[in-house]
């Protein structure tokens, strides 16, 4: 086991930290936008489950090294629509590639500090983070 | 603020947790299975993107009071193969419905010791998670 | 022992695109990210974007957004970049890094620890 | 993006100095810097990472410090095989940024 600057130093133990609790969603880093490439807008049949899927989606990296997880993987979709089964190429309009959003929980490295306001190390916050995971091929919402 | 028990219940802190880091892959409590119900096997035309899917799925709860998350959800696929477009119940055969792994972090509270194998309050354990986050409409694999 | 195998130099005319390999051996090819870096006149680093073999996760600078496409083949361990098209502005060294991971854990350090060769991409008509 | 600002492009030295090469950031970086070393033949390594963490393998003649947004490489004893262009890099954050390098010749 290895461990960060200790945010209570006791004799026991080689490093503790504090877990503050907020559940106050994160945005990304940046919003989770469609990235749509025409050469890549097809559904391959063969390769991992997101170039497989018809409504095929590429992973962008958002590190953050102050973050527990340090690296998330944002879901960009690659296509407006889906893709056809048959061809696995042409479009279908009659279905929307949309992005799967999740708030997972992380923790970010923070000053913690002493009662004097003296700094003891770090501590960690929880928070909710808006990640896109995926992208699904849905039906057009019908409004009533 | 709220918080679990202490691992080192110092003066200047409500709480500390000892985070000790393993990367070994915990199981999720139940298999992530396959769960078919034809009455269910549909995209709708409105409500959430699993139900809008052509993928549809539900979720499942997997609680765990020594995890954090505490709460964590399963997707189940409702159908073996992608629904059509066109009618948003019929099958259609050419297109897999597959389960989207991911290996999420999670945070296990264990008891931990002193330096003389004291109970010393609690401590979180980090494990990497499987979790089905989601069902895609994916073309099937052609072996080459 | 760590190497990264790089392919040879390339003569492209403008307007074409070119593929870069980076065979990697001696390590777990989906357990470290790979960098891709670009010098011009043997002088600036400039670094293109990364990818993460496991996934297909990548990373880029902003500007190699349509220049660079990058991807793996997980089965021969070999990282790939395929530039775009090609201008006299394109015509440098490209070189591939391993991303290491440090202690402590589990809030890394990352450093480019290994490196290729280089591969010297002229751009000419 | 970050901007890494090595002032020096060339310095030299004769064996045996003391040699100091700077780098600076448009921001504070919290000691997330790396150093690189590159060969004439254009060979490129890894000497220090986290300011001052030295690579395996680099002899203890190499140094790094530095905080904020001031950072330095020290190579305590000039060796003939240390003639190369050594270059910064950040990774406080996404995109990587790299100093203009810093070229140490033989007087």
């Known amino acids: 086991y290895s461990h960060w600057p200790s945010c209570c130093p006791s004799k026991g133990y080689p490093s503790e930290e504090l877990l503050r609790w907020s559940t106050v969603p994160v945005p990304p880093l940046k919003p989770a936008s469609l990235d749509f490439h025409s050469v890549s807008c097809r559904a391959s049949e063969d390769g991992p489950l997101n170039s497989r899927a018809i409504s095929p989606w590429r992973y962008e990296l958002d590190r953050d090294l102050n973050r527990l997880p340090q690296d998330l993987y944002h879901a960009r979709c690659l296509c407006p629509h889906c893709v056809s089964l048959q061809t696995g190429s042409h479009m279908d309009p009659r279905g929307n590639s949309e992005l799967l959003y999740h708030n997972q929980t992380v923790f970010y490295r923070r000053p913690c500090h002493g009662k004097k306001g003296n700094h003891k190390g770090y501590c960690l916050e929880r928070r909710l983070y808006r990640v896109s995971l995926a992208c699904v091929c849905v039906r057009p919402r019908v409004m009533g | 603020y709220s918080h679990w028990p202490s691992c080192c219940p110092s003066k200047g802190y409500p709480s500390e947790e000892l985070l000790r880091w393993s990367t070994v892959p915990v199981p999720p409590l139940k298999p992530a299975s396959l769960d078919f119900h034809s009455v269910s096997c549909r995209a709708s035309e409105d409500g959430p993107l699993n139900s809008r899917a052509i993928s549809p799925w539900r979720y499942e709860l997997d609680r765990d009071l020594n995890r954090l998350p505490q709460d964590l959800y399963h997707a189940r696929c409702l159908c073996p193969h992608c629904v059509s477009l066109q009618t948003g119940s019929h099958m259609d055969p050419r297109g897999n419905s597959e389960l989207l792994y991911h290996n999420q972090t999670v945070f296990y509270r264990r008891p931990c010791h002193g330096k003389k194998g004291n109970h010393k309050g609690y401590c979180l354990e980090r494990r990497l998670y499987r979790v089905s986050l989601a069902c895609v409409c994916v073309r099937p694999r052609v072996m080459g | 022992e760590v190497q990264l195998q790089q392919s040879g130099p390339e003569l492209v005319k403008p307007g074409g695109s070119v593929r870069i390999s980076c065979k990697a051996s001696?390590?777990?090819?989906?357990?470290?990210?790979m960098n891709w870096v670009k010098q011009s006149h043997g002088k600036n680093l400039e670094w293109i974007g990364l990818?993460?073999?496991?996934?297909?996760?990548?990373s880029h600078k902003q500007r190699f957004m349509g220049k660079a496409t990058l991807t793996v083949d997980k089965s021969s361990s070999t990282a790939y970049m395929e530039l775009l098209s090609l201008t006299s502005e394109d015509s440098a060294v490209y070189y591939c890094?391993?991303?290491?991971?440090?202690?402590?854990?589990?809030?890394?350090?990352?450093?480019?620890?290994?490196w290729g060769q280089g591969t010297s991409v002229t751009v000419s008509s | 993006d970050i901007q890494m600002t090595q002032t020096t492009s060339s310095l030299s030295a004769s064996l045996g100095d003391r040699v100091t090469i700077s780098c600076s950031a448009s921001?504070?970086?919290?000691?997330?810097l790396n150093w690189y070393q590159q060969k004439p033949d254009g060979t490129i390594k890894l000497l220090i990472y986290?300011?001052?963490t030295l690579h395996s393998g680099v002899p203890s003649r190499f140094s790094g410090s530095g905080s904020g947004t001031d950072y330095s490489l020290t190579i305590s004893n000039l060796e003939p095989e240390d003639i190369a262009t050594y270059y910064c890099?950040?990774?406080?954050?996404?995109?990587?940024?790299f100093g203009g390098g810093t070229k140490l010749e033989i007087k």
């Open positions: 890094a391993r991303e290491g991971y440090y202690g402590p854990s589990p809030f890394h350090h990352y450093a480019m620890d290994y």
């Open positions: 001696g390590y777990s090819f989906t357990g470290y990210t």
């Open positions: 990818i993460n073999p496991d996934n297909g996760g990548t």
């Open positions: 921001q504070d970086i919290s000691n997330y």
């Open positions: 986290y300011t001052s």
């Open positions: 890099q950040q990774y406080s954050k996404l995109p990587y940024t």
